[in-house]
Interface confidence: medium
């Protein structure tokens, strides 16, 4: 039987150019998390794998950081980053837990001023 | 409006504590997400710890164990307690809400770690 929930950053708004941390913690289970991965609506952003540890899939290298924690740091947005992202927690012997997150990604005429920054 | 507004800084000794506040106001939901950065002079601004709603919590490598985050959800308010501080966390701190974005960011608030 599934107990575990899935808390994510939520919907969140961002502005062109910045940076934008996506997080998800797994709670109310004892399963033992063996992977986590991130998507895009239908495409492969990174996994961070129990054993293995961080991949992140060649086109979005540039722009995506691994962290903090299992969460993943998007930087240099762009409008076409708007969308959905799924947190997909793959675990034993529950199964798959997925949390949601939407962003928005806002054009501006101060994004010069936006959020950029780096996780150590 | 949406403001963020940290207070608590000051100048404190190696191995002493402050606590940072920040006070979110101007939205109608309490954030699902808040966080605190900070930048040193010359560098880049970084992530330091983040909060979610129900509790859950990050850090940095360099302030586990030293800094605790946390948030009180009934008053928009999130908290940094600093404790064991030393001369490299010197730095101006920013709190941000819902993934770190935050635009325009606030004053932030200067902790200097210094005998």
């Known amino acids: 039987m599934m107990t575990g929930t899935i808390e994510t950053t939520g919907n969140i708004s961002a502005e062109k150019g910045g940076s934008i941390i996506l997080q998800c913690h797994l709670s109310s289970t004892t399963a033992q998390v063996t992977q986590v991965n991130w998507e895009q609506q239908d495409q492969l952003l990174a996994i961070c794998n129990a054993d293995l540890g961080w991949h992140i899939s060649p086109s979005f290298k540039d722009r995506v950081a691994p962290g903090p924690g299992l969460g993943l740091t998007l930087q240099s947005l762009t409008v076409n980053d708007t969308g959905e992202y799924f947190c997909i927690y793959h675990t034993y012997p529950d199964g798959t837990y997925t949390g949601r997150i939407f962003l928005e990604v806002l054009e501006s005429s101060v994004a010069e001023h936006g959020a950029r920054f780096q996780i150590p | 409006e949406v403001q963020l507004v940290e207070s608590g800084g000051g100048l404190v000794q190696p191995g002493g504590s402050l606590r940072l506040s920040c006070a979110a106001s101007g939205f109608t939901f309490s954030p699902s997400w808040m966080g605190w950065f900070r930048q040193a002079p010359g560098k880049e601004r970084e992530w330091v710890a983040s909060?979610?709603?129900?509790?859950?919590?990050w850090y940095a490598d360099s302030v586990k164990g030293r800094f605790t985050i946390s948030a009180d959800n009934s008053k928009n308010t999130a908290y940094l307690q600093m404790n064991s501080l030393k001369p490299e966390d010197t730095a101006v701190y920013y709190c941000?809400?819902?993934?770190?974005?935050?635009?325009?960011w606030g004053q932030g608030t200067l902790v200097t770690v210094s005998s």
């Open positions: 909060v979610l709603r129900g509790g859950y919590t």
């Open positions: 941000a809400k819902d993934g770190g974005w935050f635009d325009p």
